[in-house]
Interface confidence: low
């Protein structure tokens, strides 16, 4: 792991990209998507300890205030920093269409 | 209030903008910032129940998978959708300088 990404909570426990296999039924898409029948959903999961992958100044502030007021201010949260596009084959009234979604699969993660 | 933003958990408990007053000491900035002495930090706090202020398709997927696999997939998280700039008067070797930070104060919030 890169130095700045060393997780103080143990390997793999901090904010990082995970893949979760999901069927169209799992996603509630069975009635409008034809293909793929299964999606490898990449998402951001894990803890955001002090300054770990801090996205910006706001994340740094949040860390400081969370330390002071843990009941009021939550810790930063692990969310996508960017996305990979995905093409879905959708059902339409007239047949099928190809639609590209730019905000469906996480590409990399940070804490905010 | 807009229909899509009705919080099923009760008023004010879902993802929304909150203001937390913080001193330079609270933020750990006392040694490099001269002014302001106190900051009204706007940040995104609150729960993200099903489809509440979902930022994008990824957030919708996350909600569906969290329902199915709550131990594996976390619920969406309340984070800034955009920021307000803030000017800090900073100490420098030669005196002071004005620096604008574009990513310091949350302007509005969504769930992702």
């Amino acid at each position: 792991a890169r130095n700045g990404d060393d997780c103080p909570l143990g390997p793999g426990r901090c904010c990082r990209l995970h893949t979760v296999r999901a069927s169209l039924e799992d996603l509630g898409w069975a009635d409008w998507v034809l293909s793929p029948r299964e999606v490898q959903v990449t998402m951001c999961i894990g803890a955001c300890p002090s300054q770990f992958r801090a996205a910006n100044m706001h994340a740094q502030i949040k860390t400081s205030l969370h330390r002071l007021k843990p009941d009021t201010v939550p810790a930063p949260c692990c969310v996508p920093a960017s996305y990979n596009p995905m093409v879905l084959i959708q059902k339409t009234d007239t047949g099928v269409s190809l639609q590209t979604y730019d905000d469906l699969l996480a590409k990399d993660c940070h804490c905010i | 209030a807009r229909n899509g933003d009705d919080c099923p958990l009760g008023p004010g408990r879902c993802c929304r903008l909150h203001t937390v007053r913080a001193s330079l000491e609270d933020l750990g900035w006392a040694d490099w910032v001269l002014s302001p002495r106190e900051v009204q930090v706007t940040m995104c706090i609150g729960a993200c129940p099903s489809q509440f202020r979902a930022a994008n398709m990824h957030a919708q997927i996350k909600t569906s998978l969290h329902r199915l696999k709550p131990d594996t997939v976390p619920a969406p998280c309340c984070v800034p959708a955009s920021y307000n700039p803030m000017v800090l008067i900073q100490k420098t070797d030669t005196g002071v300088s004005l620096q604008t930070y574009d990513d310091l104060l949350a302007k509005d919030c969504h769930c992702i």
Partner: antibody, heavy 120, light 107 residues
């Protein structure tokens, strides 16, 4: 339509307490915070605090924190504001107001007001 | 607490006039500002929030503008029912505070 109906005028002596009620109708009471504001000729409009009727959580203006208590009765959709240790400068019109769902401290519907006079 | 200062404190105008009321915050409140209208013996009524969004049912002759510390409420063509007192209020953190009011009177 949204309606907030407040209790009648009160005349109190210094040192006493007053409890003002605010009955809500025309919307789901537990879906919106209730704010309390007062208005006096000397100090203008002052925000006292708010209460979340769903779980009773309160948020007070520091100025009133030690003397004001906000409560609700969900069964009657009624909010209450009690102010203790009254002084002559507490003479004012007290309003309850529904807080807009998305924005803290933004009051979209107001009660008609309750005049509280503090005099010996 | 954030101080809100309105000007003028009173204003005389005629039906049909264009009127502007200003409000200044003691610190940057971005767009977190509301305007209320109050008639004698009545409760305040929400007109504008987030500096420029008209509340439900408010006539389009009312408009709000500004951000940061300086804000204005404009009535493009005064109607008889507009003569009242107007208050600004910041929506930026606790406690929300109000301006001292601007009384709009018939000339």
């Amino acid at each position: 339509q949204v309606q907030l109906v407040q209790s009648g005028s009160e005349l109190k002596k210094p040192g006493a307490s007053v409890k003002v009620s605010c009955k809500a109708s025309g919307y789901t009471f537990t879906d919106y915070n209730m704010d309390w504001i007062r208005q006096s000729p000397g100090k203008g409009l002052e925000w006292i605090g708010d209460i979340n009727p769903n779980q009773g959580g309160t948020f007070y203006n520091q100025k009133f924190k030690d003397r004001a208590t906000l409560t609700v009765d969900k069964s009657t959709s009624t909010a209450y504001m009690e102010l203790r240790s009254l002084r002559s400068d507490d003479t004012a019109v007290y309003y309850c107001a529904r807080e807009e769902k998305l924005y803290f401290g933004l009051m979209d519907y107001w009660g008609q007001g309750t005049t509280v006079t503090v005099s010996s | 607490d954030i101080q809100m200062t309105q000007s003028p404190s009173s204003l005389s105008a005629s039906v049909g006039d264009r009127v502007t009321i200003t409000c200044r915050a003691s610190e940057n409140i971005y767009s977190y500002l509301a305007w209320y209208q109050q008639k004698p013996g009545k409760a305040p009524k929400l007109l504008v929030y987030n500096a420029k969004t008209l509340a439900e049912g408010v006539p389009s002759r009312f408009s709000g503008s500004g951000s940061g510390i300086d804000f204005t409420l404009t009535i493009s063509s005064l109607q008889p029912e507009d003569f009242a007192t107007y208050y600004c209020q910041h929506q930026y953190g606790s406690p929300p505070t109000f301006g001292q009011g601007t009384k709009l009177e018939i000339k």
